[in-house]
Amino acid sequence: ARNGDHCPLGPGRCCRLHTVRASLEDLGWADWVLSPREVQVTMCIGACPSQFRAANMHAQIKTSLHRLKPDTVPAPCCVPASYNPMVLIQKTDTGVSLQTYDDLLAKDCHCI
Amino acid sequence: ARNGDHCPLGPGRCCRLHTVRASLEDLGWADWVLSPREVQVTMCIGACPSQFRAANMHAQIKTSLHRLKPDTVPAPCCVPASYNPMVLIQKTDTGVSLQTYDDLLAKDCHCI
């Protein structure tokens, strides 16, 4: 159940897709990736207030219990709902290969 | 890639499965669920230090970028990797039904 997309905290404050520019050095990939030299990393960042983009029943439970026991149960967390594939040109023992990664870049986000 | 299961923060501090006892009232279910009266809710709670139970490449990237830009990029978050199904006896317009929910109880956890 993809619940409300209205953010009660104000525009851009709730769970959504952000883009962060990162170099191979930033990512710790310089020793095994040749290209790209820089990646536009899409990731899920933001707060998950009550029922905002609740991924499933578990997220709804978590919201309820967090309200009751905030010190014990954390609020739901903003994480990828799906991913966009990405290729990397990576070093191998014998040279290079073009490798596809399916779990690297967030495509959209939800709260869980 | 299911990375290290050793918690550098000390026993029980890192992302793992916890059980929280909750009543129907706690969950806000009293008006539509008849049974069970109380649920042993399993959920994922705990810190996600560097590479601890990293769910995938995205989690590894997030760890690297959080280290570089802690104010911009949050650390990975402890969320369910899979779920255990659960049945609820719920009220209907005509009486009751037995309904299975596949996304209610966390089965195991990872960091993403």
Epitope: S35, P36, P85, M86, V87, L88, I89, L98, T100 | -
Partner: antibody, heavy 118, light 107 residues
Framework: QVTLLESGGGLVQPGGSLRLSCSFS??????????VGWIRQAPGKGLEWLAH???????YFNTALKSRLTISKDTSKNTVYLQMNSVRAEDTAVYYC??????????WGQGTTVTVSS | DIVMTQSPSSLSTSVGDRVTITCKAS??????VAWYQQKPGKSPKFLIY???YRYTGVPDRFSGSGSGTDFTFTISSVQPEDFAVYYC?????????FGGGTKVEIK
Amino acid sequence: QVTLLESGGGLVQPGGSLRLSCSFSGFSLSTYGIGVGWIRQAPGKGLEWLAHIWWNNNKYFNTALKSRLTISKDTSKNTVYLQMNSVRAEDTAVYYCARMGYDIMDYWGQGTTVTVSS
Amino acid sequence: DIVMTQSPSSLSTSVGDRVTITCKASQDVNTAVAWYQQKPGKSPKFLIYSSSYRYTGVPDRFSGSGSGTDFTFTISSVQPEDFAVYYCQQHYSTPWTFGGGTKVEIK
């Protein structure tokens, strides 16, 4: 398994236009870092890069031919198109499409022959 | 545009011989040079990336080196299936440009 197949070649009148298609399988143009390029080879000559299009719809063109070229993609159909206007005899060539991963062109089609003649 | 000048334009050699082809860029391209093999009536085959990295499945008798403006492609021991035309290409900046090709023929 990656395959590319060019089509749309044949006889074209000077001054006319040609539209080539590159149908591919084994990869997706919605994948970050992936592109499709066009390269041609005149009879008995070397290779000449024409244009390429990226997953994010960024496009790059051969400087000398830029005004005559259009490149586009239909991601859902796994097809890339190259249109060339105002063709002349020197555009006679085998036209290849190739898969690109950043600056690698690792898989090529078998080519389609274009002859410009009246 | 960056001009890639390849030499020689053709060479004759025998099976087992060592073959060296050179490519000169009109400006500094760092290590951004690729090499391709093309047999008659066939499409080019990608061999070397970024001056010296063999692509997946390419035999180790093929190698490349160089940086800046001067690049070398070597076949350490020519096999019968290696007789073909070889092209260098700069992938430093668009427009990407190819060398004129080197035809490796049987002596």
